[in-house]
């Protein structure tokens, strides 16, 4: 195991356990957690007499790092006394050192309440030149606080000669003020008001607060997807709201149909991003045959910092329809990465819009996160295309040489899905891993250079083309083909590609 | 049927202060945002300010300041606090109630109340 | 802050007429855009919301369209009634800007 450096712990009894006319007292400090072997534990009794014993060092069963107890037992006027614990820890460091100072026992205690608040702004909502801000720390059982000013964590020098502090009933309240030039408050910097009692540490933060017209929260309802609705048959829709600025107020999202029937119960999810906004999803079960029928869901948002509510409502797509056309094809071995191959599937001139894509191998449908699938995108007609692209291995074409790729859409009949099968070595019987068989035909064209594929950006042959080596049980133009014009007076060149 | 009635409208000196009134009904005032919008005699409407269902609020960028606007759910009202009143305060002051979609719109309007500011 | 440019800033039509408004804002909006009616002496009149939802009880000779930055209400055969001050209104939850309303058409009889 690596070196590790211990946390020390005190350990202390409670006051009301120990008996007043009790004439001496144990206390202890635990080193936990370090590696390697040993550690020093020295005591600092100020003016009392005190024995220490250090107990032999346990291992940990989980992670084989050490602990160790030292126990110190003083007699005399303990009750007002501090002690430290001072616990060294040479394989980390020749000066690697942890205090802990604290009191023989500890009391039930009453824990402060931290809240900073802030000057006002003037009356035209503009920043003053400087702007206080003030630590409430309240409610605690009397006793020592330490007051700390970070700004952006790092500790400020602050006097803190103005705090104040003031006792009602049985409890205190402190206060500490900073003040800061407005420039140092628009930096868009925190100030954390840190309090220290009784070995614990307390705090509230603030900063110059966003503009209060938010900006850019946006709401987005998705339909179900084709897959969730026509082949698991158990569709749901999802709310998204996102660039929230994260507060105290929770978003409430309200589901209702417009149909004014029941909803079911839908499940919801809270998610802080990485530039500090928050993302909340819910996600609403819908009946198959409502959707189908034309039902209207709608997601209303409310927040605290959302001026107006906002409602998103989906419904199915209304328009024509068109089944899609599915190609699968898979791309020529590549210099280099022969245990690899790449496979394509376009999928075009469907409409509405709403398709999923799968791809199966084996009759097994491969994972989501395999294939990576455009969004739709408009024809230069009336309907949409995708790309789907999948990575496969040799293990798995020498495995079996087929995998699938399957559109599911409404309009795809009889049973809403569209599949074709693609193999990485078209023609090889069991899908043995060979070279890539040799074209049987010939593409003249003019115009093109020998060996280029002429429908890199997405055009088709010739049309005096003809396509051949498809499979015949293929409606439609097959996956991974060579196509032949006859020449005229050309030099004869090959494109293995899509038809 | 949904009804909003403003009030407090009239005479004013620049300078001085007025507190506008919405009266809601047959609604639950609590499920709604609500908005003011003021009028200037021949021009086009101009957004004052809108608080939320939870009472929070927000103001056109030149009302920030003089324009208060707050909500009592528990007596179905609506105000509008205007401070340091000037000649250019003086319009049709319209409370109205936004839909409770949302982000859509103002269903209702009130008659509205007529501020005038002069010496 | 998103500004709101309505033209033309008025109108001559005939009954029967077809009359389209259009209103440009300054930048996309994403929530709803609202159209309102106004009669001299009375409050405005919802007349679509959501860019394109007609409101409740507005004759169907009334449509929206838009989105992004150019949204359009369209009357599709004006009536005696439709005379009157039309004013778009982004209800955009996510901008305050200094004026949310459109500077307003009027329709007058040609």
């Known amino acids: 195991a690596s070196t590790q450096s211990p946390s020390v712990f005190p350990l202390t009894r409670c006051c009301k356990n120990i008996p007043s006319n009790a004439t001496s007292v144990t206390l202890g400090c635990l080193a936990t957690g370090y590696f390697p072997e040993p550690v020093m534990v020295t005591w600092d009794t100020g003016s009392l007499n005190g024995t220490t014993m250090t107990l032999p060092a346990t291992t940990l069963t989980l992670s084989g790092h050490y602990a160790t107890i030292s126990l110190l037992t003083v007699s005399g006027a303990w009750a007002k006394q501090m002690f430290t614990c001072r616990v060294a820890h040479t394989p980390s460091s020749t000066d690697w050192v942890d205090n802990k100072t604290f009191s023989v026992c500890s009391r039930d205690f009453t824990p402060p309440t931290v809240k900073i608040l802030q000057s006002s702004c003037d009356g035209g909502g503009h920043f003053p030149p400087t702007i206080q801000l003030l630590c409430l720390v309240s409610g605690y059982t009397p006793g020592t606080i330490n007051i700390t000013w970070l700004e952006d964590g790092q500790v400020m020098d602050v006097d803190l000669s103005t705090a104040s502090t003031t006792q009602e009933g049985e409890l205190a309240s402190t206060q500490s003020e900073l003040t800061l030039s407005q420039k140092h408050w628009l930096s868009d910097r925190t100030y954390t008001c840190q309090v220290t009692y009784q070995g614990h540490t307390f705090e509230d933060s603030t900063k110059k607060c966003a503009d209060s017209n938010p900006r850019g929260v946006s709401a987005y309802l998705s339909r179900p997807s084709p897959f969730d609705l026509f082949i698991r048959k158990s569709p749901t829709i999802t709310c998204l709201v996102v660039d929230l600025a994260p507060s105290k107020g929770t978003v409430n999202l309200t589901w209702s149909r417009a149909s004014g029937k029941p909803v079911n119960h839908s499940t919801r999810k809270e998610e802080k991003q990485r530039n500090g906004t928050l993302t909340v999803t819910s996600t609403l079960p819908v009946g198959t045959r409502d959707w189908i029928e034309g039902e209207t869901y709608q997601c209303r948002v409310t927040h605290p910092h959302l001026p107006r509510a906002l409602m998103r409502s989906t419904t199915k797509t209304s328009g024509p329809r068109a089944a899609p056309e599915v190609y699968a094809f898979a791309t020529p071995e590549w210099p280099g990465s022969r245990d690899k191959r790449t496979l394509a599937c376009l999928i075009q001139n469907f409409m509405p819009e709403d398709i999923s894509v799968q791809w199966l191998h084996n009759e097994v449908q491969l994972p989501d996160a395999r294939h990576s699938t455009t969004q739709p995108r408009k024809t230069k007609g009336s309907g949409f295309f995708v790309f789907s692209r999948l990575e496969v291995t040799r293990a798995e074409w020498e495995q079996k040489d087929e995998f699938i790729c399957r559109a599911v859409h409404e309009a795809a009949s009889p049973s809403q899905t569209v599949q074709r099968a693609v193999s990485v070595n078209p023609g090889l019987a069991g899908g043995s891993a060979q070279s890539q068989r040799a074209p049987d035909r010939v593409l003249c064209h003019s115009g093109q250079q020998q060996g280029l594929p002429r429908a890199a950006g997405g055009s088709v042959p010739h049309p005096r083309c003809h396509c051949g080596a498809g499979r015949a049980d293929w409606p439609g133009p097959p996956e991974l083909d060579v196509c032949v014009e006859e020449a005229e007076g050309e030099a004869p060149w090959t494109w293995t590609g899509l038809c | 049927q949904v009804q909003l009635v403003e009030s407090g409208g009239g005479l004013v000196q620049p300078g001085g202060s007025l507190r506008l009134s919405c009266a809601a009904s047959g609604f639950t005032l609590s499920n709604h945002d609500m908005t003011w919008v003021r009028q200037a005699p021949g021009k086009g409407l101009e957004y004052v300010s809108i608080i939320n269902t939870y009472g929070n609020h927000w103001y056109a960028n030149w009302a920030s300041g003089r324009f208060t606007i707050s909500r009592d759910n528990s007596k179905n009202t609506v105000y509008l606090q205007i401070d340091s009143l000037r000649a250019g305060d003086t319009a049709t002051y319209y409370c109205a109630r936004e839909t409770h979609h949302g982000s859509s719109g103002i269903d209702h309007w009130g008659q509205g109340t007529l501020v005038t500011v002069s010496s | 802050d998103i500004q709101m440019t309505q033209s033309p800033s008025s109108v001559s039509a005939s009954v029967g007429d077809r009359v389209t408004i259009t209103c440009q804002a300054s930048e996309s909006i994403y929530s709803g855009l609202a159209w309102y009616q106004q009669k001299p002496g009375q409050p405005p009149k919802l007349l679509i919301y959501d860019h394109s939802t007609l409101a409740s009880g507005v004759p169907s000779r009334f449509s929206g369209s838009g989105s992004g930055t150019e949204y359009a209400l369209t009357i599709s055969s004006l009536q005696p009634e439709d005379f009157a001050t039309y004013y778009c209104?982004?209800?955009?939850?996510?901008?305050?800007?200094?004026?949310?309303f459109g500077g307003g058409t009027k329709v007058e009889i040609k």
């Open positions: 209104q982004h209800a955009d939850y996510a901008h305050h800007s200094d004026n949310v």
